[in-house]
Interface confidence: low
Amino acid sequence: EDELQVIQPEKSVSVAAGESATLRCAMTSLIPVGPIMWFRGAGAGRELIYNQKEGHFPRVTTVSELTKRNNLDFSISISNITPADAGTYYCVKFRKGSPDDVEFKSGAGTELSVRAKPS
């Protein structure tokens, strides 16, 4: 069986300040079982943007039915973008573990750039 791939189809996305940004991500398989998380940046200092499993992320919405049984689409939309939101966003698949989930595979990243709000 082919190993799961994390697809982030866009290398970059440009959004005007105040608008919403869509960051696309899809999995090629339902296996292994485990949550998806979105981060800005890589490495130890990365910022958690969205956790499928838990947490409150008021500016983030998922664009598909994450609760649907065979869902492979983990794209998100971030509202009210500001210049502070610029950066590279990674969609990361975790493998369910005990006691902690373990990072399994990351997408290649999507760079979000923010344009000045149109006058």
Partner: antibody, heavy 122, light 107 residues
Framework: QVQLQESGPGLVKPSETLSLTCAVS?????????WAWIRQPPGKGLEWIGS???????YYNPSLKSRVTISVDTSKNQFSLKLSSVTAADTAVYYC???????????????WGQGTTVTVSS | EIVMTQSPATLSVSPGERATLSCRAS??????LAWYQQKPGQAPRLLIY???TRATGIPARFSGSGSGTEFTLTISSLQSEDFAVYYC?????????FGGGTKVEIK
């Protein structure tokens, strides 16, 4: 199956506000996807007006953004369009649709209402 | 905004013949392109998404190809129910924009 039904006045006076509602059946808006409004002037092509998510997050067409408000009422499983300061140029068939263009794969508008004709005239 | 240009504006084809419709984007839209069919008095119907994937329930005689700025919708053997207006739509950069449409009429 998912069905969408537009409703609202068929005649609006110039300078007034056009208000339409789209009732969704067979699918809970809160379950996901964006929901869109598209219009088609008589004998012309299609124009995307904007889309909304159940949280209220919106995308608008910049050409209409100053006059458009799209809102959602998850308790009634419906979403609405308001277009202010209308002129004769806003006369069109207005469609609501399920917008599956923001996920991956990028599907586009996969379910449409039958459309409602709005005429702007005094 | 991205301008989508469809050609020809009208295509006259006999039933059973092949129809080839073109859609050109003013800048790259990757493969984020959809095709719709619209019959008089009806809402558009999604035919193709992702430039080349048929939507659920769409017959195999409809096929899409292309990426970047040049796209094609092909109807391999026109049936009577295929005479309609066809629109392309880019879903890559806001605002989403449609082409002006190609009317496929009976020759």
């Amino acid at each position: 199956q998912v069905q969408l039904q537009e409703s609202g006045p068929g005649l609006v006076k110039p300078s007034e506000t056009l208000s339409l509602t789209c009732a969704v059946s067979g699918y809970s808006i809160s379950s996901g996807y964006y929901w869109a409004w598209i219009r088609q002037p008589p004998g012309k092509g299609l124009e995307w007006i904007g889309s909304i998510y159940h949280s209220g997050s919106t995308y608008y067409n910049p050409s209409l953004k100053s006059r458009v408000t799209i809102s959602v009422d998850t308790s009634k499983n419906q979403f609405s369009l308001k277009l202010s300061s209308v002129t004769a140029a806003d006369t069109a068939v207005y469609y609501c649709a399920r917008d599956r263009s923001r996920g991956y794969p990028v599907y586009g508008m996969d379910v449409w209402g039958q459309g409602t004709t709005v005429t702007v005239s005094s | 905004e991205i301008v989508m240009t469809q050609s020809p504006a009208t295509l006259s084809v006999s039933p059973g013949e092949r129809a080839t419709l073109s859609c050109r984007a003013s800048q790259s839209v990757s493969s984020n392109l959809a095709w719709y069919q619209q019959k008089p008095g009806q809402a558009p119907r999604l035919l193709i998404y992702g430039a080349s994937t048929r939507a659920t329930g769409i017959p195999a005689r409809f096929s899409g190809s292309g990426s970047g700025t040049e796209f094609t919708l092909t109807i391999s053997s026109l049936q009577s129910e295929d005479f309609a207006v066809y629109y392309c739509q880019q879903l890559n950069i806001h605002p989403w924009t449609f082409g002006g449409g190609t009317k496929v009429e009976i020759k």
